[in-house]
C-alpha cells in the first residue's frame, strides 16, 4: 500500500509570546513545528515516529496565519508519505518550537525551546475530506486540519490496491475508486485484454484481435463466421461442417455435380411426353401418339399410323386424312371388301377363308406378314420396344435391342452399375459417374483404378493433428483430414472454444 498523511496548519496564536517553561521569547517567539506520526497508542509515548516525521521552517512570530504553499520550504499542507496498508488509526504529535537561529533550517540550530505541543489519537479513514480541529492550552491555540489520501495509482479504503490505467495489449482499462478495473469500451476479461467481437460473431468459429471484428477460423466464412466452407469443387451441395459436400436432392457424386434428376431439372421431353430418369444425365422420353424424336419434338403426319387398310393410300388433310381405296375395297379406312376368296386376295402365301356365306373373307398370314391381305411385312420395331435409348434392329423373324453403354436386358431395361465389376484395386471406393466409374483411393495408392502404389503418400507425413484421420485422393492437396470432436481446420489444428488457463502467481 501507499498513501500520504496530510496536515494543514492554519493558525497559531501565542499572544504573550511565552515558552512552555513560562519564559518569554525576546523579541518574540520565532515559531517552527515538529510533527511526529505513529501507530495508534492509547497513551502517547516517546519513541520512533513509525509512520513518519517532518519539520517546518520558521512560519511566523508569536501569532500568525499559515498560508498554503505547494512547493519549496514551508510547504503547507505538510506531507507524510507511507508505504504500507493504512491501518485506519494513528497517533499525531504536533510541537511548536522557538528558534533563535536559521529561519529555513531551525532543526539544526542550538538553543531551540518548546512553546507547546498537542497530541491527537484516533481513527481516520482514507478520503478527500479534511478533518478540521483546534487545540488550546493556557498560552496557545492551534487550528489545523488533516486527512489521509492514497498515492497516485493506489486505491481502496487502506490504499492497498495498486492500479495503473492502461491501454495496450496487456489491458485496456481505467481504475475505479476502489482500485478495480473498468474496461474501456470494446474490451472485456479480468484484465480487459479480451476484445468484444462483432455482435453475433460465432464463439467457436470466429475470433477477433480488436473490438467489433470477426475473423473466421479455417473452414468458416460469412460476416459472423457461421457459414461453413464446403469441399473445394462442391457444385450442388452444402455443408454442416467445413469441407463437407452433402448433395442437394437430385444430385450425386463426390462433388455433387452428377445430375440424378435430369427430368425435373431440365424437362427435356416435349409435347406432353413422359420423362424417365435413367442414371446420371440419362433420361428417356415416351411420346404421346402423333409425336416422335428423342424428345418427342417431332409431330407425326396424320398418315403416320397407317390408318388405311387393304393397301389403301393415305393422304394428309388439314386436321385429318383421307384413304384412297384400291379396287374391291371401300369405307373410311378401306376396311370393307367387295372381294371374295375367288379373287385370290391374300398375298405372300396367305390362306383365304370365306366368311358370311361367301360374301366376305379373312386372310391367315404366314409368319413375318400381316395386314388384311398379308400385304405387309412385319416390322417388330414399330412399337419402340427398346428402353433407355436402345436401338431396335430387325433380325429375320425376330428383333434385337442394341443397348447404350450402362444398360442391358432384352429391352435395355436394366441399368448396369459400373461398380458391379469392382474395378477399384487396393480397397478403393467406386463411384458411378456418367462417363464411367471413378475410384477414390486409400492412402498410398493412386491412378484411375487405384492400381498405382504411391511412393510418397500425402498422409505419410502425418499432416492431420489432434488424432484426425487422413484420406488421400479427395482434394487438390492430395489429402483430407477428418477431425475428431472438438477440433476444426483443414488439418484439425484449431481447438473449438479454448478454455482460459490459470498460470501461477506469486
Amino acid at each position: 500500500g501507499s498513501g500520504i498523511f496530510q496536515l494543514r496548519l492554519q493558525e497559531f496564536v501565542n499572544q504573550r509570546g511565552m515558552l512552555a517553561n513560562g519564559q518569554s521569547c525576546e523579541p518574540g517567539c520565532r515559531t517552527f513545528f515538529r510533527i511526529c506520526l505513529k501507530h495508534f497508542q492509547a497513551t502517547f509515548s516517546e519513541g520512533p515516529c513509525t509512520f513518519g516525521n517532518v519539520s517546518t521552517p520558521v512560519l511566523g512570530t508569536n501569532s500568525f496565519v499559515v498560508r498554503d504553499k505547494n512547493s519549496g520550504s514551508g510547504r503547507n499542507p505538510l506531507q507524510l508519505p507511507f508505504n504500507f496498508t493504512w491501518p485506519g488509526t494513528f497517533s499525531l504529535n504536533i510541537q511548536a518550537w522557538h528558534t533563535p537561529g536559521d529561519d529555513l533550517r531551525p532543526e539544526t540550530s542550538p538553543g531551540n525551546s518548546l512553546i507547546s505541543q498537542i497530541i491527537i489519537q484516533g481513527s481516520l479513514a482514507v478520503g478527500k475530506i479534511w478533518r478540521t480541529d483546534e487545540q488550546n492550552d493556557t498560552l496557545t491555540r492551534l487550528s489545523y486540519s488533516y486527512r489521509v489520501i492514497c498515492s497516485d495509482n493506489y486505491y481502496g479504503e487502506s490504499c492497498s490496491r495498486l492500479c495503473k490505467k492502461r491501454d495496450d495489449h496487456f489491458g485496456h482499462y481505467e481504475c475505479q475508486p476502489d482500485g478495480s478495473l473498468s474496461c474501456l469500451p470494446g474490451w472485456t476479461g479480468k484484465y480487459c485484454d479480451q476484445p468484444i467481437c462483432l455482435s453475433g460473431c460465432h464463439e467457436q468459429n470466429g475470433y477477433c484481435s480488436k473490438p467489433d471484428e470477426c475473423i473466421c477460423r479455417p473452414g468458416w466464412q460469412g460476416r459472423l463466421c457461421n457459414e461453413c466452407i464446403p469441399h473445394n469443387g462442391c457444385r450442388h451441395g452444402t455443408c454442416s461442417i467445413p469441407w463437407q459436400c452433402a448433395c442437394d436432392e437430385g444430385w450425386g457424386g463426390l462433388f455433387c455435380d452428377q445430375d440424378l434428376n435430369y427430368c425435373t431439372h431440365h424437362s427435356p421431353c416435349k409435347n406432353g411426353s413422359t420423362c424417365s430418369n435413367s442414371g446420371p444425365k440419362g433420361y428417356t422420353c415416351t411420346c404421346l401418339p402423333g409425336y416422335t424424336g428423342e424428345h418427342c419434338e417431332l409431330g407425326l403426319s396424320k398418315c403416320a399410323s397407317n390408318p388405311c387398310r387393304n393397301g389403301g393410300s393415305c393422304k394428309d388433310q388439314e386436321n385429318s386424312y383421307h384413304c384412297l381405296c384400291p379396287p374391291g375395297y371401300y369405307g373410311q379406312h378401306c376396311e370393307h371388301s367387295t372381294l371374295t376368296c375367288a379373287d385370290s386376295p391374300c398375298f405372300n402365301g396367305g390362306s383365304c377363308r370365306e366368311r358370311n356365306q361367301g360374301s366376305s373373307y379373312a386372310c391367315e398370314c404366314p409368319p413375318n406378314f400381316t395386314g388384311s391381305n398379308c400385304e405387309k411385312k412385319v416390322d417388330r420395331c414399330t412399337s419402340n420396344p427398346c428402353a433407355n435409348g436402345g436401338q431396335c434392329q430387325n433380325r429375320g423373324p425376330s428383333r434385337t435391342c442394341r443397348c447404350r453403354p450402362g444398360f442391358t436386358g432384352t429391352h435395355c431395361e436394366l441399368h448396369i452399375s459400373d461398380c458391379a465389376r469392382s474395378p477399384c484395386a487396393h480397397g478403393g471406393t467406386c463411384h458411378d459417374l456418367e462417363n464411367g466409374p471413378v475410384c477414390t483411393c486409400p492412402a498410398g495408392f493412386s491412378g484411375r483404378r487405384c492400381e498405382v502404389r504411391i511412393t510418397h503418400d500425402a498422409c505419410a507425413s502425418g499432416p492431420c493433428f489432434n488424432g484426425a484421420t487422413c484420406y488421400t485422393g479427395l482434394s487438390p492437396n492430395n489429402f483430407v483430414c477428418n477431425c475428431p470432436y472438438g477440433f476444426v481446420g483443414s488439418r484439425c489444428e484449431f481447438p473449438v472454444g479454448l478454455p482460459p488457463s490459470f498460470p501461477w502467481v506469486a
Epitope: L162, K165, H169, F170, P500, S501, P503
Partner: antibody, heavy 121, light 107 residues
Framework: EVQLQESGPGLVKPSETLSLTCTVS??????????WGWIRQPPGKGLEWIGD???????YYNPSLKSRVTISVDTSKNQFSLKLSSVTAADTAVYYC?????????????WGQGTLVTVSS | EYVLTQSPDFQSVTPKEKVTITCSGQ??????ASWYQQKPDQSPKLVIY???KRPSGVPSRFSGSNSGDDATLTINSLEAEDAATYYC?????????FGQGTKVEIK
C-alpha cells in the same frame, strides 16, 4: 513446467533473412493469458525487445525494427516464429523467445535458453 | 521513443551489504515495472513484477518500488549468488522497453 526452445541457423549472410522458431512444451500456446515474445542481446550488450504475438495471430513490433520483422504462430505445432529480413552485422545477437504473462502485467516468467545468430558472409 | 535509464551502470558490493538500483523514465510510476536478473551465459530471470511483487522462488531480500519517474530494485543483505546484471523493463503502449542494465559484482 513450461519450456521454450529456440531453433534455427546459427549463421546468416548479410542482406538475407534470419528465421527462428520457438517450440513451447509443457503448456498450450493457445492460452488467452499469454503473449509470446522475441528478445535479442548483442554480444556484451543489453536486452532489446523485438516483438510479440498472441495465439490468434495479433502481432506487436518494436518500431525500430517493424519494417523488417514478421512474427507468426502455428498453434497446431505449439510454435511461434521470427523472421528478420535484410540482416546486417548489427543483427548479430543471442535471440531469446519468452512468455509474457498478462497476469504479471507483461512480465516474462519463462525464457528459452537463447540461440546465437551470427551475420557474416 | 520511450527510454529507461538505469543507475549505476556498475556496482561492486561486499556480501551482506544493501544494493539499490534505480531505473528512470518519464512518468515511470504510471507504468508497471519488472526487473530481471541475468547471470553470465544464462537467460534472464524475472525477480520483480508489477513494481514490487516477487515470483515464487525469488528470495525475500529482493524488493521493488515505483513512483514518480523512478523505479527501484533493492537487494537487502547481498549474497554471492546475487552477482549478475539486472535489467528493468516497462511497457510503453504496445512496445517493451528495457533499461541498459546494471552489473552487480561481489567485492
Amino acid at each position: 513446467e513450461v519450456q521454450l526452445q529456440e531453433s534455427g541457423p546459427g549463421l546468416v549472410k548479410p542482406s538475407e533473412t534470419l528465421s527462428l522458431t520457438c517450440t513451447v512444451s509443457g503448456g498450450s500456446i493457445s492460452s488467452s493469458s499469454y503473449y509470446w515474445g522475441w528478445i535479442r542481446q548483442p554480444p556484451g550488450k543489453g536486452l532489446e525487445w523485438i516483438g510479440d504475438i498472441y495465439y490468434t495471430g495479433s502481432t506487436y513490433y518494436n518500431p525500430s525494427l517493424k519494417s523488417r520483422v514478421t512474427i507468426s504462430v502455428d498453434t497446431s505445432k505449439n510454435q511461434f516464429s521470427l523472421k528478420l529480413s535484410s540482416v546486417t552485422a548489427a543483427d548479430t545477437a543471442v535471440y531469446y523467445c519468452a512468455r509474457e504473462d498478462v497476469i504479471l502485467r507483461g512480465g516474462s516468467d519463462y525464457w528459452g535458453q537463447g540461440t546465437l545468430v551470427t551475420v557474416s558472409s | 521513443e520511450y527510454v529507461l535509464t538505469q543507475s549505476p551502470d556498475f556496482q561492486s558490493v561486499t556480501p551482506k551489504e544493501k544494493v539499490t538500483i534505480t531505473c528512470s523514465g518519464q512518468r515511470l510510476g504510471d507504468k508497471y515495472a519488472s526487473w530481471y536478473q541475468q547471470k553470465p551465459d544464462q537467460s534472464p530471470k524475472l525477480v520483480i513484477y508489477e513494481d514490487s511483487k516477487r515470483p515464487s522462488g525469488v528470495p525475500s531480500r529482493f524488493s521493488g518500488s515505483n513512483s514518480g519517474d523512478d523505479a527501484t530494485l533493492t537487494i537487502n543483505s547481498l549474497e554471492a549468488e546475487d552477482a549478475a546484471t539486472y535489467y528493468c523493463q516497462a511497457w510503453d503502449r504496445d512496445t517493451g522497453v528495457f533499461g541498459q542494465g546494471t552489473k552487480v559484482e561481489i567485492k
